[in-house]
């Protein structure tokens, strides 16, 4: 039978807390924001030929959470190290990309000023999920 | 990644024992009663992104390029975060109070870096 005393948070609520809506204006809590970045601005255009720009996602927002509102896990939802750390004075949760969740970007590159080209994967460039970690 | 030794203020891994009893989780996490989960703390100056093992990804390099050019310095905070996590074997109740023993991923912070 299910627990008779309801647990404070469901796994779904926990996921919502960790991955809030992606609309930055919605609130200041940790979320994924977007920026159009050109490789020219970065000074990488002599290396990366195509695409000229890409949508750069980054994590932004606060991770402040009063201890009374701590997301408590439930049976069946194993904890993440970040959760207990709200109680540790030195450990300040940081709004960042979840480790292991970054995607690569396929680009066309040159190393000889444009005489020859090859396709490469730029690793760990696209942020998929943000969380307070 | 750096280990916190009390002398560095840079992003490092701080050893820390998480006691499930103290945070009231010992009613559904059966074993262990606690473990060294550790955490990351310290500053992430722009130059640290270029230090091998401290930059968590190519993404960090992009952010720092932007910062150093003063293009959009505001929105992206530099974070000292886990860059390597490991799993731990745990015994716990699922939501129907059946007992589950499994290796739970991302339980232990092994290394930290700037993101």
């Amino acid at each position: 039978s299910a627990p008779s005393m309801p647990w404070p948070w469901s796994p779904a609520a926990l996921r919502l807390l960790q991955r809030p809506p992606e609309e930055p204006s919605a609130h200041a809590f940790c979320h994924r924001a977007a920026l159009n970045i050109s490789f020219q601005e970065l000074g990488w255009d002599r290396w990366i030929v195509h695409p000229p720009s890409f949508i750069f996602h980054y994590c932004h927002g606060s991770c402040g959470m009063p201890t009374s509102d701590l997301p408590l896990p439930v049976p069946g939802a194993p904890p993440t190290p970040a959760q207990p750390l709200f109680l540790v004075p030195g450990a300040k949760p940081c709004c960042a990309a979840l480790p292991g969740s970054m995607r690569s970007l396929r680009v066309r590159t040159t190393s000889d000023g444009g005489y020859s080209f090859k396709y490469e994967m730029v690793p760990n460039l696209i942020t998929q999920h943000c969380a307070c970690i | 990644g750096l280990e916190c030794d009390g002398r560095t203020s840079l992003c490092c891994r701080q050893q820390f024992f998480i006691d499930f009893r103290l945070i009231g989780w010992n009613d559904w996490i059966i074993a262990p009663t606690g473990y060294y989960g550790n955490y990351c703390e310290g500053s992430c100056p722009a130059y640290l992104a270029g230090v091998p093992g401290s930059a968590s990804s190519f993404h960090t390099a992009v952010v720092n390029q932007y910062r150093m050019r003063g293009l959009n310095p505001g929105p992206v905070n530099s974070c000292c975060i886990p860059t390597k996590l490991s799993s731990m074997s745990m015994l716990y109740f699922d939501d129907e109070y059946n007992i589950v023993k499994r290796d739970v991923p991302n339980m232990i912070v092994e290394e930290c870096g700037c993101a």
């Epitope: 008779s4 005393m5 | 009893r21 010992n26 009613d27």
Partner: antibody
């Protein structure tokens, strides 16, 4: 040493309620689940439910969900089981037992109370 | 729920004899979450064998346990008079946790 103290006997009338107690000593009360087990005369053992003294979280055997209520008083290190609307079927010995850690992820009901004999009779 | 069926319900054995009693589960149970309890008349049950094959503190070495999946057994290598009591198997893998009906061991 670990001890679980239960009153010896309770005599109750049909339809009435009874609140059984189990006082724990000799260990950190809030670190262990407490279990209740029923044994009718000459019969086997039946698991009723469990309560965690730290949080008050409970889990019941569906069969006993309406008839039994488990509660805890941390200040006196005592767990209680209230049995309501009693019938002759509830005449039994009720044991409380600590669910303890045996090492290497092994758990079991390692310490038992002496049991309270409940007799339902008019 | 997982039903545990113990057989035989009552068995007789001579002193010094080898005794085996069995417990069959209606569905598979992890050997880690399977125990045996001993109960003497008028007393509370005592943990006897935990996690299928580990003897609880103070249990004589003549006792052993084995099994996996749906079939488990308790064996006494040489029966002694004090062993003539009731034994219950128990699983806590799936809620609700259940006990077998018991095997009462008597002296022949």
């Amino acid at each position: 040493q670990v001890q679980l103290q239960q009153p010896g006997a309770e005599l109750v009338k049909p339809g009435a309620s009874v609140k059984l107690s189990c006082k724990a000593s000799g260990y950190t009360f809030t670190n262990y689940w407490m279990y209740w087990v029923k044994q009718r005369p000459g019969q086997g053992l039946e698991w009723i439910g469990m309560i965690h003294p730290n949080s008050g979280s409970t889990n019941y055997n569906g069969k006993f969900k309406t008839g039994a209520t488990l509660t805890v008083d941390k200040s006196s290190s005592t767990v209680y089981m209230q049995l309501s609307s009693l019938t002759s079927e509830d005449s039994a010995v009720y044991y409380c037992a600590r669910w303890g850690y045996g090492g290497n992820y092994d758990y079991a009901m390692d310490y038992w109370g002496q049991g309270t004999s409940v007799t339902v009779s008019s | 729920q997982i039903v545990l069926t113990q057989s035989p319900a009552i068995m007789s054995a001579s002193l010094g004899e080898r005794v085996t009693m069995t417990c069959t589960a209606s569905s598979s149970v992890s050997s880690s979450y399977f125990h045996w309890y001993q109960q003497k008349p008028g007393s509370s049950p005592k943990l006897w064998i935990y996690s299928t094959s580990n003897l609880a503190s103070g249990v004589p070495a003549r006792f052993s346990g084995s099994g996996s999946g749906t079939s488990y057994s308790l064996t006494i290598s040489t029966m002694e008079a004090e062993d003539a009591v009731t034994y219950y198997c128990h699983q806590y893998h799936r809620s609700p946790w259940t006990f077998g009906g018991g095997t009462k061991l008597e002296i022949k």
